[in-house]
């Protein structure tokens, strides 16, 4: 039986699509192709007769059509107006015609899709950050990635405006990365270039690692003080020292040589994230000992404070 | 007192490389990032880059990358700066500057600055 | 790179005149905006950071202020020894920028 491929099947606009004719009789003659699915002399788009290989436009030729010998018929730079059904008609010695017909669909060239973004910037559980995927396609699936990945499953994840736009709602430290939209149609896909969220954080309660000198777990005096603070956060963090509250230096290392017990007390390290407006410190008390004994490092409860 | 005191005036032919240096007293060398800042005659500032004196770290201005390069000598606490394929427009004032602390801080104290003339 | 843009490029005022000069960022500093006086002949020196942060020793008639992309560098009493030029840098990561400058001079 005499059937019809098309290939593809959904076509984008401006490509082109084979219709392919399968189980053609021995006894055949010629070949004539109609749009519709019907024969009608004001549909015919191209006759073609074997014997001459002389192929005839009709009135529905465009020339964008080329009939082949074995009676396919190529469409090139479709638009969505040949999408349909197309008929085959093909003509036997033996005036018995048979006919097929087979159709496609299609669909628009899908444009570079592009992420706005209400906040590139956001500080953690504070701010919501709305992604959207323009423009407006109808028919067309949206799809988000974020560094390369399919979205995770997250109760602070959501999807809205047929997937149009992607909240992230009271964002994290690990929300941060690379995000691109995809839209696609059946015929086709296309991908945003990558927007970055840089999720502003911080900053977290700081510590404090003593690093002595000479390596021992007690502060005799004589030995050098290296106290090193750290904290997360982005941007970095401000740091700044006070001995027994007396405003220090403004670097993640404090050192001092050759402690004494004049240097007892309490050292605090202070930490600061103008971005996020967010503060944080803590302290640790230090004793020296005189002679042999070895007091050692205590850490005091640290305290932090959020404007 | 913190003092950064730079190496005298130079001056070099088009296409040759000069090395500033800047000796660092009055304070812990490594605890604090070092920059280096230039500004040609009448006009205005222009960073370069900074050295981590602690680790040996660089990071440079996009404009100066490849013909710039910065190191350090913790034992003698001085900071070098080197500018390569010199062209007349790298004629400028070349100031060391020290960060007022780790991490997004400005610059509090500067060198005196060393005069360098690029000419044929 | 972040563009740092100063008005007025120059000015001139009495002494004891309130002086105001603006830096705008191109993208949110966050208050990471730091101002120098530049004497002439000398080396820049640092005024205020963080905005609004005075160095020690520097005399309370200067002040700053602003937030986001916008801010101001104020002299509340102009003296003949401010005459300078004044430069706004931000100091949130690197490549720090610097303003292109404000040359302040007495009437």
């Known amino acids: 039986k005499l059937t019809i491929e098309s290939t593809p099947f959904n076509v984008a606009e401006g490509k082109e699509v084979l219709l392919l004719a399968h189980n053609l009789p021995q006894n055949r003659i010629g070949y004539s192709w109609y749009k519709g699915e019907r024969v009608d002399g004001n549909s015919l788009i191209v006759g073609y007769v074997i014997g001459t290989q002389q192929a005839t436009p009709g009135p529905a030729y465009s020339g964008r059509e080329t009939i082949y010998p074995n009676a396919s018929l190529l469409i090139q730079n479709v638009t969505q107006n040949d999408t349909g059904f197309y008929t085959l008609q093909v003509i036997k010695s033996d005036l018995v015609n048979e006919e097929a017909t087979g159709q496609f669909h299609v669909y628009p060239e899908l444009p570079k899709p592009s992420i706005s973004s209400n906040n590139s910037n956001p500080v953690e559980d504070k701010d919501a950050v709305a992604f959207t995927c323009e423009p407006e396609v109808q028919n067309t699936t949206y799809l988000w990635w974020v560094n390369g990945q399919s979205l995770p499953v997250s109760p602070r994840l959501q999807l809205s405006n047929g997937n149009m736009t992607l909240t992230l709602l009271s964002v994290k430290r690990n929300d941060a990365g690379s995000y691109e939209c995809e839209i696609q149609n059946p015929a086709s896909a296309n991908r945003s270039d990558p927007v970055t969220l840089n999720v502003l954080y911080g900053p977290d309660v700081p510590t404090i690692s003593p690093i002595i000198s000479p390596p021992d777990s007690s502060y005799l005096s004589g030995a050098n003080l290296n106290l090193s603070c750290h904290s997360a956060s982005n941007p970095s963090p401000q740091y700044s020292w006070r001995i027994n509250g007396i405003p220090q230096q403004h670097t993640q290392v404090l050192f001092i040589a050759k402690i004494t017990p004049n240097n007892n007390g309490t050292y605090a390290c202070f930490v600061s994230n103008l971005a996020t407006g967010r503060n944080n410190s803590i302290v640790k008390s230090i004793t020296v000992s005189a002679s042999g004994t070895s007091p050692g490092l205590s850490a005091g409860a640290h305290h932090h404070h959020h404007h | 007192q913190v003092q950064l005191v730079q190496s005298g005036a130079e001056v070099k032919k088009p296409g040759a490389s000069v090395k500033v240096s800047c000796k660092a007293s009055g304070y812990i060398f490594t605890s604090y990032w070092l920059h280096w800042v230039r500004q040609a005659p009448g006009q205005g500032l222009e960073w370069i880059g900074y050295i981590n004196p602690q680790t040996g770290y660089t990071n440079y201005a996009q404009k100066f990358q490849g013909r710039v390069t910065m190191t350090r000598d913790t034992s003698t606490s001085t900071v070098y700066m080197e500018l390569s394929s010199l062209r007349s427009e790298d004629t400028a004032v070349y100031y060391c500057?020290?960060?007022?602390?780790?991490?997004?801080?400005?610059?509090?104290?500067w060198g005196q600055g060393t005069l360098v003339t690029v000419s044929s | 790179d972040i563009q740092m843009t100063q008005s007025p490029s120059s000015l001139s005022a009495s002494v004891g005149d309130r002086v105001t000069i603006t830096c705008r960022a191109s993208?949110?500093?966050?208050?990471?905006l730091a101002w120098y006086q530049q004497k002439p002949g000398k080396v820049p020196k640092l005024l205020i950071y963080n905005t609004k942060n005075l160095v020690e020793g520097v005399p309370s008639r200067f002040s700053g202020s602003g937030s986001g992309t916008d801010f101001t560098l104020t002299i509340s009493s102009l003296q003949p020894e401010d005459v300078a030029t004044y430069y706004c840098?931000?100091?949130?990561?690197?490549?720090?920028?610097f303003g292109q400058g404000t040359k302040v001079e007495i009437k």
């Open positions: 500057a020290r960060e007022y602390g780790n991490y997004n801080y400005p610059l509090d104290y």
């Open positions: 840098q931000h100091h949130l990561g690197t490549p720090y920028t």
């Open positions: 993208e949110n500093q966050y208050g990471y």
